[in-house]
Amino acid sequence: NQDLPVIKCVLINHKNNDSSVGKSSSYPMVSESPEDLGCALRPQSAGTVYEAATVEVDVSASITLQVLVDTPGNISCLWVFKHSSLNCQPHFDVQNRGVVSMVILKMTETQAGEYLLFIQSEATNYTIVFTVSIRNTLLFTLRRPYFRKMENQDALVCISESVPEPIVEWVLCDSQGESCKEESPAVVKKEEKVLHELFGTDIRCCARNELGRECTRLFTIDLNQTPQTTLPQLFLKVGEPLWIRCKAVHVNHGFGLTWELENKALEEGSYFEMSTYSTNRTMIRILFAFVSSVARNDTGYYTCSSSKHPSQSALVTIVEKGFINATNSSEDYEIDQYEEFCFSVRFKAYPQIRCTWTFSRKAFPCEQKALDDGYSVSKFCNHKHQPGEYIFHAENGDAQFTKMFTLNIRRKPQVLAEASASQASCSSDGYPLPSWTWKKCSDKSPNCTEDIPEGVWNRKANRKVFGQWVSSSTLNMSEAMKGFLVKCCAYNSLGTSCETILLNSPGPFPFIQDSIS
């Protein structure tokens, strides 16, 4: 067929960037180069129906189905999936191609199936069929690692019951705070299941396979550190193993450590101690408290006491099911064009969440930072001052959480005008949403000051373009007006913008950019 190819169908895979997914803190989206799905005309089908190559997606992978149409000008579209129609926002790239995208975040079985895209342009209509299936990894799992004591040895084993068999590594750091970030030179990684060196400051175990990377930190109370202002809190689900490490350093060996739960000493067999001399001949002792499978009655205050240090406690809370606690009320913000601003969500969650920030159907990396009060915070600053709806989405296997933000950028209107045989219409962005005036230009009013009182129809915020509200005003044209110049003006508290339109018979209309104040 000589009328090909006017459309191009591509698949964009968003790979979970391995190096950062390990920081269970983030869930970044790194796009690979688009893969051509070779949309071909479906033979013997009514109308113009294109069929893309079947897309196979891994569980939890994120993809974008994208169609490029070499048709400038007005195009409208609609996605249909399992008899539900989905919002569709076409835009144009710098080469004037219409671009229509469907983002599938974290693929699940329910998202597999046939996606139909209907595109209507001035010239023609297309139907594009995408078949999305889940790659046969449904049996794949990746579970957070947990600790076990090695039989007859002072060592910890890291276990992750995952399919395929994961690679397990210990991530060790002897510094404090920021310098223990994953790629820091202070961090040492050991790709083995058993760890004997249990005296380090920060100890984590990570497991990775085709589905990504999950890590668990060894919860530690350090009696030589100033206690946090709020009591550290450790959440566990019923049946999970509990491990708490108490660590203390003293000038000599003349001190001991003990664990108590709610002022009662822990039973024999639910703790073990290790000690060593450090390079400066001080004594380091660590005392582990552990429960192989926690029950509700293991909840409470665990206190580590020393004969030479002030005691410190942690609150262990056993829950039936994971949770995400945060306020989900939507938040609206209004900022200036160059004002620095970040969205922020404060939450408490167990198990740790994976999260994404989404704007205009595009997912952005989500970083989370632990706060001293047991809460975490995720901030998003990369909005590039684009107005619209921003979505924070978090999930952890047991719970899901979504919070909506609206960002409005204060700026004066910018008017776009168009006309048909029967009406002229102007549309404008800008915030606050503008009001409209229409003026007629004539011999009596060469400066276009004569008001047009009738036939004007205003629609405010009637559609979203790239997540941004647009206001429009339409002038219904009477025969008497044909051949006249009219001026539409949009104004808000930040300024006014106008366009002049020649009311004419249909055809190309000259639009003269006019006064902008």
Epitope: I7, D36, L68
Partner: antibody, heavy 118, light 106 residues
């Protein structure tokens, strides 16, 4: 079969204007961008601009913006390029070419040789 | 505007020899397309989307690359391959072509 038939060779005086034509056949003329490309003797290719016959949207290379004018006549499936204020630097072969959504030119005209000389 | 630099400008190869020519972009581009032009004729689409052969192009041709570095390779030179090859990008608003590599037969 897709064909782009260009007008014949032109010899014009410096300072004058010329209109080259490109007649399309074998496909839906209004569904594809028509592009114009310049090739000076023994030189590479330079994009001048393009026009979408379905809605007369036009893009120009900045270097040609003030001297090239692209138009179409959809009734005869013909694209035109007018070049004004001609100088000897405009002596070249001018091609029309059809663009596809993959952003390459799949069919080219045979070229029109323009000679600007007094 | 993205500038494409082709090298070498002129090269010659014996029949059966492997030939590689390169196209370097001044900034990253998504795809590269290649055209073949023989003296006195219009350019012909040859390779599109970096590595896909246009219909009728012999399988001895291949294209590869990403970012700013792309290449066209002929696995075994034949006399009919003698021509000028141009690379072209359209990642930016305006398309640009390379200066061409003229391939001659020894």
């Amino acid at each position: 079969e897709v064909q782009l038939q260009e007008s014949g060779a032109e010899l014009v005086q410096p300072g004058a204007s010329v209109r080259l034509s490109c007649k399309a056949s074998g496909y839906t003329f209004t569904s594809y961008w028509i592009n114009w490309v310049k090739q000076r003797p023994g030189q590479g290719l330079e994009w001048i601009g393009n026009i979408y016959p379905g809605s007369s949207i036009i893009n120009y290379n900045e270097n040609f913006k003030n001297r090239a004018t692209l138009t179409v006549d959809t009734s005869s499936s013909t694209a035109y390029m007018q070049l004004s204020s001609l100088t000897s630097d405009d002596s070249a072969v001018y091609y029309c070419a059809r663009r596809v959504v993959y952003l390459y030119f799949d069919y080219w005209g045979q070229g029109t040789t323009l000679t600007v000389s007094s | 505007q993205i500038v494409l630099t082709q090298s070498p400008a002129i090269m010659s190869a014996s029949p059966g020899e492997k030939v590689t020519m390169t196209c370097s972009a001044s900034s990253s581009v998504s795809y590269m397309h290649w055209y073949q032009q023989k003296s006195g004729t219009s350019p012909k689409r040859w390779i599109y989307d970096t590595s896909k052969l246009a219909s009728g192009v012999p399988a001895r041709f291949s294209g590869s690359g990403s970012g700013t570095s792309y290449s066209l390779t002929i696995s075994s030179m034949e006399a009919e391959d003698a021509a000028t090859y141009y690379c072209q990008q359209w990642t930016s608003k305006s398309p640009t072509f390379g200066g061409g590599t003229k391939l001659e037969i020894k």
